[in-house]
């Protein structure tokens, strides 16, 4: 979706997700998600950022990594790895604070 | 339209712990648009956010309930869950659940007490 | 944290007058992301005002935002019985998320 003009300078980014209009995307910051979910193979999505910068600096877990870039088209060819399983005792968790 | 339903036990007895789980309908809860939150309001008073979750599972607490909130989300089933353990009677109040986007907060469930009592 | 702070407390008024309700911030609203929602007895919030000044969908055009950085103001610019309830400002859009403590409007 547009991002109002009040938002400040946006960038324009790859889209690589189920829920992308196209090929390209505008927002405040470029996004790469990378997710696994239980039983499945990790699945990278590449868009827009506007909201919760906060994510950009979670640690990665062996569920999900985020990554955050602020110029044009620069989640392009960006690859994401997820942490290896750790022991319980060590799992960092996904909340970033 | 996207709605939201909060669904859960109405009563916890104290030391327990209290789990809520919000449906989100007529939409997807994996649009990398939307983070879901948790809201609540004790008897009478203001709006406590407690915190969201992405649908990548990536979430953040309000930092006074941190230690005991756990936020999860299930996207085969639509769903987002909460989770607030050792609860008291501080706890009771309306728990809501709402979608957060650039478009602040623009739906909300319809909210679901919950009583600490034993 | 971003602490707000609305005033007054309490409006008095009477319908058709012009309402004006504000919301202050303890740290500049980043990309104004500062919404506004009404909330009547026994239901949830309704958003009014997003992005400090963007009107909801199916809000009507007597309710408007407006400000930047620290302050926020929302305007009825003339009441309806129906408008009388409480309303809450809210910082969004990063973490912590805050609401203020509330005004709330009441008929004179």
């Known amino acids: 979706d547009p991002v109002k003009p009040s938002r400040g300078p946006l960038v324009t980014c790859t889209c690589e997700s189920p829920h992308c209009k196209g090929p390209t995307c505008r927002g405040a910051w470029c996004t790469v998600v990378l997710v696994r979910e239980e039983g499945r193979h990790p699945q990278e999505h590449r868009g827009c950022g506007n909201l919760h910068r906060e994510l950009c600096r979670g640690r990665p877990t062996e569920f999900v990594n985020h990554y955050c870039c602020d110029s044009h088209l620069c989640n392009h060819n960006v690859s994401l790895v997820l942490e290896a399983t750790q022991p319980p005792s060590e799992q960092p968790g996904t909340d970033g604070q | 339209q996207v709605q939201l339903q909060e669904s859960g036990p109405g009563l916890v007895k104290p030391s327990q712990t209290l789990s809520l789980t919000c449906t989100v309908s007529g939409g997807s809860i994996s649009s990398n648009d939307y983070y879901w939150n948790w809201i609540r309001q004790h008897p009478g008073k203001g709006l406590e956010w407690i915190g969201y979750?992405?649908?990548?599972?990536?979430?953040y607490y309000n930092p006074s309930l941190k230690s005991r909130v756990t936020i999860s989300v299930d996207t085969s089933k639509n769903q987002f869950s909460l989770k607030l353990s050792s609860v008291t009677a501080a706890d009771t109040a309306v728990y809501y659940c709402?979608?957060?986007?650039?478009?602040?907060?623009?739906?909300w469930g319809q909210g679901t007490t919950v009583t600490v009592s034993s | 944290e971003n602490v707000l702070t609305q005033s007054p407390g309490t409006l008095s008024l009477s319908p058709g007058e012009r309402a004006t309700l504000s919301c202050r911030a303890s740290q500049s609203v980043s990309s104004n992301y500062l919404a506004w929602y009404q909330q009547k007895p026994g239901q949830a919030p309704r958003l009014l005002i997003y992005g400090a000044s963007s009107g909801a969908t199916g809000i009507p055009d007597r309710f408007s935002g407006s400000g930047s950085g620290t302050d926020f103001t929302l305007t009825i610019s003339r009441l309806e019985p129906e408008d009388f309830a409480v309303y809450y400002c809210q910082h969004y859009g990063s973490s912590p998320i805050t609401f203020g403590q509330g005004t709330r409007l009441e008929i004179k």
């Open positions: 979750i992405y649908y990548s599972g990536s979430t």
């Open positions: 709402a979608r957060e986007s650039t478009d602040g907060m623009d739906v």
